[in-house]
């Protein structure tokens, strides 16, 4: 469930901190009810290029655990389309504490409203 | 050449437990995630259990859950399968299966083991 | 679950001819990122699975290109454009982008 997908952003969040990773990421800061799959779809993304950034195993792994779990349960809740929202690229690009803080806001948001 | 060599099958009572290895050769294994898939005899295949590479994250169907467990030591190059509470059903030949990364090249299972097979039988 | 349900379930094919599998997924397999994880895996007479087709369409190495994958969505198909007689054997669609993953039943080819 999203408590997992948090606590797994707690674990990278804990993780890069002993790493110099200096990439910016394409961040949604103030998602909209209405575009929050097609931000969480965005804040997948890029963790994947946390992952590459980084090298480490247990980021990695973290990384695709996150995914699977992120896609066992937007799929249980049906196809969800999305119009009107904001492609990545045009998001802006923070610092990944700021990036991280945001991811979990927006997984909070799921878990308010399931 | 990437060598998967799985053993440790044999006949086993049901309710009893039995552990499955499969040794790596020929590739670093503690890059790869790693699965194991069972073939019952004359029927088609069905996964039974994947692990991360690091060994934190596991996965199973139903059908197996609680009661199959996938580990791995990645000292010794080793994939491991502790199966308990069997059943007639689990009766199969069991393969084991390097998996590459979702992040670096899209999930699938791309060799195999020879397979090893589990009669469960009293 | 997703249930991946392939036919036909039996092939019989003339040498040199082509042949065609299709694999139907219960829902769609796109998964969040936009990665659609489906495979097909051939199963000689006798021998372990083999990697033919990674993510729709993409051979693995090794793979003659006579084998193809196709398809979006719900719906997939591995297509040989002229089947050898090394090609008997079972084929199988495999679906891994939500958990628990799954094969399809299998398509058994052989030689008419």
């Known amino acids: 469930n999203w408590v997992n997908v948090i606590s797994d952003l707690k674990k990278i969040e804990d993780l890069i901190q002993s790493m110099h990773i200096d990439a910016t990421l394409y961040t949604e800061s103030d998602v909209h009810p209405s575009c929050k799959v097609t931000a969480m779809k965005c804040f997948l993304l890029e963790l994947q290029v946390i992952s590459h950034e980084s090298g480490d195993t247990d980021i990695h792994d973290t990384v695709e655990n996150l995914i699977i779990l992120a896609n066992n349960i937007l799929s249980s809740n049906g196809n969800i389309t999305e119009s009107g929202c904001k492609e990545c690229e045009e998001l802006e690009e923070k610092n990944i504490k700021e990036f991280l803080q945001s991811f979990v806001h927006i997984v909070q948001m799921f878990i308010n409203t399931s | 050449e990437v060598r998967l060599m799985a053993s440790g099958g044999g006949l086993v009572q049901p309710g009893g437990s039995l552990r499955l290895s499969c040794a790596a050769s020929?590739?670093?294994?503690?890059?790869?995630?790693m699965s194991w898939v069972r073939q019952a005899p004359g029927k088609g295949l069905e996964w039974v259990a994947t692990i991360s590479r690091g060994g934190d994250y596991t996965y199973y169907p139903d059908s197996v859950k609680g009661r199959f467990t996938i580990s791995r030591d990645n000292s010794k190059n080793t994939l491991y399968l502790q199966m308990n509470s069997l059943r007639a059903e689990d009766t199969a030949v069991y393969y084991c299966?390097?998996?590459?990364?979702?992040?670096?090249?899209?999930?699938?299972?791309?060799?195999w083991g020879q397979g090893t097979l589990v009669t469960v039988s009293s | 679950d997703v249930v991946m349900t392939q036919s036909p379930l039996s092939l019989p094919v003339t040498l040199g001819q082509p042949a065609s599998i299709s694999c139907r997924s219960s829902q769609s397999i796109v998964d969040i990122t936009g990665n659609t994880y489906l495979e097909w895996y051939q199963q000689r007479p006798g021998q372990s699975p083999r990697l033919l087709i990674y993510k729709v369409f993409n051979r693995f190495s090794g793979v003659p290109d006579r084998f193809s994958g196709s398809g979006s969505g719900t719906d997939f198909t591995l297509k040989i454009s002229r089947v050898e007689a090394e090609d008997v054997g079972v084929y199988y669609c495999?679906?891994?982008?939500?958990?628990?993953?799954?094969f399809g039943q299998g398509t058994k080819l052989e030689i008419k």
């Open positions: 299966a390097r998996r590459v990364s979702m992040i670096t090249g899209g999930w699938a299972m791309d060799y």
């Open positions: 495999f679906q891994d982008s939500f958990v628990p993953y799954t």
């Open positions: 020929e590739f670093t294994f503690s890059n790869y995630a």
